[in-house]
Interface confidence: low
Amino acid sequence: FNISGCSTKKLLWAYSTRSEEEFILFCDLPEPQKSHFCHRSQLSPTQVPDHLPFTDSKDLPDVQWYRQPSNGDPLEDIRKSYPHIIQDKCTLRFLTPGVNNTGSYICRPKMIKSPYDVACCVKMILEVKPQSNASCENSASHKQDLLLGSTGSISCPSLSCQSDAQSPEVTWYKNGKLLSMTRSNRIVVDEVYIYHQGTYVCDYTQSDTASSWTVRAVVQVRTIVGDTKLKPDILDPVESTLEVELGKPLTISCKARFGFERVFNPVMKWYIKDADLEWEVSVPEAKSIKSTLKDEIIERNIILEKVTQRDLRRTFVCFVQNSIGNTTQSVQLKEKRGSGGLNDIFEAQKIEWHETVRFQSHHHHHH
């Protein structure tokens, strides 16, 4: 196809010889075509254009990329000729740096919607060169880490040696989307969340007398977490006594907050103390009821089919533990005054008698 009508952009990749880094080209198709190809997922069903390409082939890239050989040979299909370059929707990812990546890259819609779209293409002239050794020793890494829950910043590697005052205007992208909130050589993050992780691209313009280039760098940002230094705390039950009605079913809930741990093995169990004996109770599985970046709230219930006289003499203990330590909360049952008639009490005593027999045989098995 004729590429003379393609819009042209010049980019410079100055790669560090000390580190492995990636590079990304965006297929910046002129609007409004771009929205049809790259951002389909952002369109609501009522906004879908009539001639939207690839409605049956979601997994195929929406644009086609080519490389233009410098000797004037026909355009090369990147997927076939360059295994170190990955085509991903509207981006081209270079997995390895090197001057051999220098060249002209052309992107166009995989499927044109009308004859007028033949010129809907972008030609990117990419110059790749190693960063000179004279440049700043402490330049920012192409892999940067942010500690979850704290403040942090993401620096543009090609500009990290310049003060904010000297720095040119920078355009930032995250996972291919423009970030309009910052124009400086670093992004300050007031509180780091998981969503801050991703692939960031920073662009700035460098001009000489002859022409103007976009200098681009790619930063892989990962979010990391520090372990809690606290043992879990029990949120419920708060009170150490609980008023109950004899003969009625009862559920006691234990809720505890566990701080984040890199290997999370929370322990939560109920056990019963009766005189000198204590045993763990088989209760329903614990479940997570709230999960945040820094902690998780887990709940586990103990269920009594009917409260008996014996239960009033027992202590019900919720035990929780993480790698730092454990916490317990004891609950004593207390009969509600004026509750239940004679029938309820008689029923409760019958249950108690059956339970005593069951407990004694269970006890005998264990010892």
């Epitope: 890494s141 704290s150 998981i194 992780q197 372990d227 290997v263 093995n265």
Partner: antibody, heavy 124, light 107 residues
Framework: QVQLQQSGPGLVKPSETLSLTCTVS????????WSWIRQPPGKGLEWIGY???????NYNPSLKSRVTISVDTSKNQFSLKLSSVTAADTAVYYC??????????????????WGQGTTVTVSS | AIQLTQSPSSLSASVGDRVTITCRAS??????LAWYQQKPGKAPKFLIY???SLESGVPSRFSGSGSGTDFTLTISSLQPEDFATYYC?????????FGQGTRLEIK
């Protein structure tokens, strides 16, 4: 670019204490976990333990009684001490950075930056 | 401790071959598995995390798969620089453990 530089003696006498230090350059020791791993000659890798910059440690139970890992944030370094060594402790010892990667629904930790390795021989 | 068993212990292959290494865990570890490459006299190099996610800068001919107890590392088309020893590592529970390694040699 974070780099790890290991230092310490290559020869230790039996029953003595092996001491190695790992210095972090090109980045801060803060906010990361740091591990020690060893590899006996011709064998596989064995994790010794980790330390968080705050001082929290976790050791391999098989070595726990003999291992101490400490951190000095002011010097940007962390250290390994292994007491009462025997010939079975002869190995290449590596220090490494552990990073947490938010992958799918969970956090997984991998050792993404390694020291150059120190060959330690236990012999009289 | 969770044991990781790699197979085969060693294998010979030629440049351009497709190679698969397996790693079996003694109990389920979800997808908390990483793969490393080690060349003689060098420190291990991190390749894959979360069983199948490729570390930045690792060539796309490397791929990982699996979940639970059975995992594989595949090199789709062997290059001369791929001849090395490969280790799997679990981070699901302490102590962290590694497989015994698979030595990949030139045929």
């Amino acid at each position: 670019q974070v780099q790890l530089q290991q230092s310490g003696p290559g020869l230790v006498k039996p029953s003595e204490t092996l001491s190695l230090t790992c210095t972090v350059s090109g980045g801060s020791i803060n906010n990361y976990y740091w591990s020690w791993i060893r590899q006996p000659p011709g064998k596989g890798l064995e994790w010794i333990g980790y330390i968080f910059y705050s001082g929290t440690t976790n050791y391999n139970p098989s070595l726990k009684s003999r291992v101490t890992i400490s951190v000095d944030t002011s010097k940007n370094q962390f250290s390994l001490k292994l007491s009462s060594v025997t010939a079975a402790d002869t190995a290449v010892y590596y220090c490494a950075r552990d990073v947490g990667i938010a992958a799918r629904n969970s956090y997984y930790y991998v050792m993404d930056v390694w020291g150059q390795g120190t060959t330690v021989t236990v012999s009289s | 401790a969770i044991q990781l068993t790699q197979s085969p212990s060693s294998l010979s292959a030629s440049v351009g071959d497709r190679v698969t290494i397996t790693c079996r865990a003694s109990q389920g570890i979800s997808s908390a598995l990483a793969w490393y490459q080690q060349k003689p006299g060098k420190a291990p190099k991190f390749l894959i995390y979360d069983a199948s996610s490729l570390e930045s800068g690792v060539p796309s001919r490397f791929s990982g798969s699996g979940s639970g107890t059975d995992f594989t590392l595949t090199i789709s088309s062997l290059q001369p620089e791929d001849f090395a020893t490969y280790y799997c590592q679990q981070f699901n529970s302490y102590p962290i453990t590694f497989g015994q390694g698979t030595r990949l040699e030139i045929k």
